[in-house]
Interface confidence: low
């Protein structure tokens, strides 16, 4: 499995690096955070792409002022956006 | 909280077969690959076999000291791996370890590990 | 198969003291390297992944580097609960662990 990797990029400009993944990968990870106050204000945003050994949570997270979401694929280089 | 808990163990014959079952829970077992490791009476640690999840066919991988004896199982309905051991021989005894890695911290660790269940194998 | 040559294979030191042991892999395994620990009669603990990464709630003291065929792990400030057998592990390519360091409490 291939899959883009960065960490904590703010833009997915930056998170065009194509990986080789351990034979333990599964999974390409694509987790978005961002923080603010509901849909008004956003205080900050960063992209991460990693090789997983499994799809961390299923579905997006939100936690106070912050949310997460984590979308997870299973072909090469399917973490692209 | 994560927990694996293995079960099956016992006094077999050489050349016998016996299979040893883990049960997990706590976390999304679907999702994660599998191991079993074991550690013979006072000697070190040794891992033996893995298996790896559905979306990539199962696939199994062994130490070549068990290759072609033992055979690693999964049931995803039920949250167990399974070790059936087949031909055993009196090295073979050992205390046999179920373990996971924790995939929320992304590593691929061993980071949860079952109590270990005893695998005696004399004539 | 890759071999973990691991060393010392027992240590007596005292409390406070700093331990340090090492792992050498026969071939490259990158930073694939974990540490574990092992108390009498328990199941194994995962202290250090990826060479040199602190496990959740391992505590400060437990710490690992190198890359390639060289790692070392320290226990700086040595405490009488780390009484226990540690162990290299790599991961590069299947996995295989050291033979184990024995510490004890002098």
């Known amino acids: 499995l291939m899959c883009f990797s960065c960490l904590n990029q703010k833009s997915n400009l930056y998170c065009l690096k194509p990986t080789i993944c351990s034979d333990q990968d599964n999974y390409c990870v694509t987790v978005s955070a961002s923080a603010g106050i509901g849909n008004l204000v956003t205080f900050g945003h960063s992209l991460s792409k990693t090789c997983s050994p499994a799809c961390p949570i299923p579905e997006g997270v939100n936690v106070g002022v912050a949310s997460m979401g984590i979308s997870c694929c299973q072909s090469f280089l399917c973490n692209f956006s | 909280a994560v927990q694996l808990v293995e079960f099956g163990g016992g006094l077999v014959q050489p050349k016998e077969s016996l299979k040893i079952s883990c049960a997990a829970s706590?976390?999304?077992?679907?999702?994660?690959?599998m191991h079993w490791v074991r550690q013979a009476p006072g000697k070190g640690l040794e891992w033996i076999a893995r298996?790896?999840?559905?979306?990539?066919?199962?696939?199994?991988y062994y130490a070549d000291s068990v290759k072609g004896r033992f055979t690693i199982s999964r049931d995803d309905s039920k949250s167990m791996v399974y070790l059936q051991m087949d031909n055993l021989k009196t090295e073979d005894a050992a205390m046999y370890y179920c373990?996971?890695?924790?995939?929320?911290?992304?590593?691929?660790?061993?980071?949860?590990w079952g109590q270990g269940t005893l695998v005696t194998v004399s004539s | 198969d890759i071999v973990m040559t691991q060393s010392p294979t027992s240590i007596s030191i005292s409390v406070g003291e700093r331990v340090t042991m090492n792992c050498k892999a026969s071939?490259?395994?990158?930073?694939?390297v974990d540490w574990y620990q092992q108390k009498t009669g328990q199941s194994p603990e995962l202290l250090i992944y990826?060479?040199?990464n602190r496990y959740t709630g391992v505590p400060g003291r437990f710490t690992g580097s190198g890359s390639g065929t060289d790692f070392t792990f320290t226990i700086s400030n040595l405490q009488a609960e780390d009484l226990a057998v540690y162990y290299c592990?790599?991961?590069?390519?299947?996995?295989?662990f050291g033979a184990g360091t024995k510490v004890e409490i002098k």
């Open positions: 990826k060479a040199s």
């Open positions: 298996i790896r999840t559905k979306p990539v066919n199962y696939e199994t």
């Open positions: 592990m790599q991961s590069d390519t299947k996995y295989t």
């Open positions: 373990s996971a890695p924790n995939y929320y911290d992304g590593t691929y660790s061993f980071a949860y």
């Open positions: 071939q490259n395994v990158g930073s694939n």
């Open positions: 706590g976390f999304t077992f679907s999702t994660v690959a």
